[in-house]
């Protein structure tokens, strides 16, 4: 297993509709054709997997049907969007990138993006 650098923004504020987007960029040491991206959430010293997708370079990211994540890739960048977020989902969202094929296997873990989600005040048709 070889290490790889992964960069992501330090802070992102979710929209009033509970949507947060950020870019996860990795320094690919070679020409990977199969990449796996995993989003982890760290809160209260617990780490949980939010979503994961494997994609072939040049193709769309495919998350599971019931995933709260969507994404697109462009070169060594992955644009991730997480939806359905509310204040209790505030936390550190860590981007983990694995270069699965061809060998050698590379693993990179970002420092995390702190996503802040704010509960709106009671008002007509606001998003919570």
């Amino acid at each position: 297993c070889k290490a790889m650098h992964v960069a992501q923004p330090a802070v992102v504020l979710a929209s009033s509709r509970g949507i947060a987007s950020f870019v996860c960029e990795y320094a690919s040491p070679g020409k990977a054709t199969e990449v796996r991206v995993t989003v982890l959430r760290q809160a209260d010293s617990q780490v949980t997997e939010v979503c994961a997708a494997t994609y072939m370079m040049g193709n769309e990211l495919t998350f599971l049907d019931d995933s709260i994540c969507t994404g697109t890739s462009s070169g060594n960048q992955v644009n991730l969007t997480i939806q359905g977020l509310r204040a209790m989902d505030t936390g550190l969202y860590i981007c983990k990138v694995e270069l699965m094929y061809p060998p050698p296997y590379y693993l990179g873990i970002g420092n995390g993006t702190q996503i802040y989600v704010i509960d709106p005040e009671p008002c007509p048709d606001s998003d919570f």
Partner: antibody, heavy 123, light 107 residues
Framework: QVQLVQSGAEVQKPGASVKVSCKAS????????MHWVRQAPGQGLEWMGI????????NYAQKFLGRVTMTRDTSTSTVYMELSGLRSEDTAVYYC????????????????WGQGTLVTVSS | DIQLTQSPSSLSASVGDRVTITCRVS??????LNWYRQKPGEIPKLLIY???SLQSGVPSRFSGSGSGTDFTLTISSLQPEDIATYYC?????????FGQGTKLEIK
């Protein structure tokens, strides 16, 4: 096991207020949102509002703005729904239901409901 | 306000039939939709969340699909205990509006 236990049936006069309680047990109270949903006799489900027991913030359906107040008491793991200016069309069964944050592992929304509280508004 | 419209409002089917209920939403909600079953005199029970995730303990004859504005609940083989009213609901964002319900009866 998870339980949401609501207060008993109420009969109120038009113009009065009613306060229904929902006591949670079997899970971490402040880790789940709580909703209030009502159902008039023979009618469908109607969402009233949501409260975050952690911070106490709430959000209400437009229809109930100015008439409903949702509060919580973390010391007793209880949420309250108070509806004022009661009218006959407020006669309904009122339910509380819990709702985890979307990132909670194996968390499903509205997975547990209270048994319901019948509020009758009659002169 | 966001509107959820279920169709049909009521339907009658035979035991063993494949039954489909649809829910149309007035704006794009991605996959953030729940389905419930409410039997007469009982509290609502969550069947499907996030459009297609089967809630724990719910029989596999229930399935959900759809995204955006059009969603479907399917019962692959209707059972007598499925006599109930079924509701869709927008979730994870206020207002958490319900559809008007679909009353399912056995022929």
């Amino acid at each position: 096991q998870v339980q949401l236990v609501q207060s008993g049936a109420e009969v109120q006069k038009p113009g009065a207020s009613v306060k229904v309680s929902c006591k949670a047990s079997g899970y971490t109270f402040t880790s789940y949102y709580m909703h209030w949903v009502r159902q008039a006799p023979g009618q469908g489900l109607e969402w009233m509002g949501i409260i975050n027991p952690s911070g106490g913030s709430s959000n209400y359906a437009q229809k109930f703005l100015g008439r409903v107040t949702m509060t919580r008491d973390t010391s007793t793991s209880t949420v309250y729904m108070e509806l004022s200016g009661l009218r006959s069309e407020d006669t309904a069964v009122y339910y509380c239901a819990r709702d985890p944050p979307i990132t909670m592992v194996r968390g499903a929304p509205f997975d547990y409901w209270g048994q319901g509280t019948l509020v009758t508004v009659s002169s | 306000d966001i509107q959820l419209t279920q169709s049909p409002s009521s339907l009658s089917a035979s035991v063993g039939d494949r039954v489909t209920i649809t829910c149309r939403v007035s704006q794009d909600i991605s996959r953030l939709l729940n389905w419930y079953r409410q039997k007469p005199g009982e509290i609502p029970k969550l069947l499907i969340y996030r459009a297609s995730s089967l809630q724990s303990g719910v029989p596999s004859r229930f399935s959900g699909s759809g995204s955006g504005t059009d969603f479907t609940l399917t019962i692959s083989s209707l059972q007598p205990e499925d006599i109930a009213t079924y509701y869709c609901q927008r979730t994870y964002s206020a207002p958490y509006t319900f559809g008007q319900g679909t009353k399912l009866e056995i022929k």
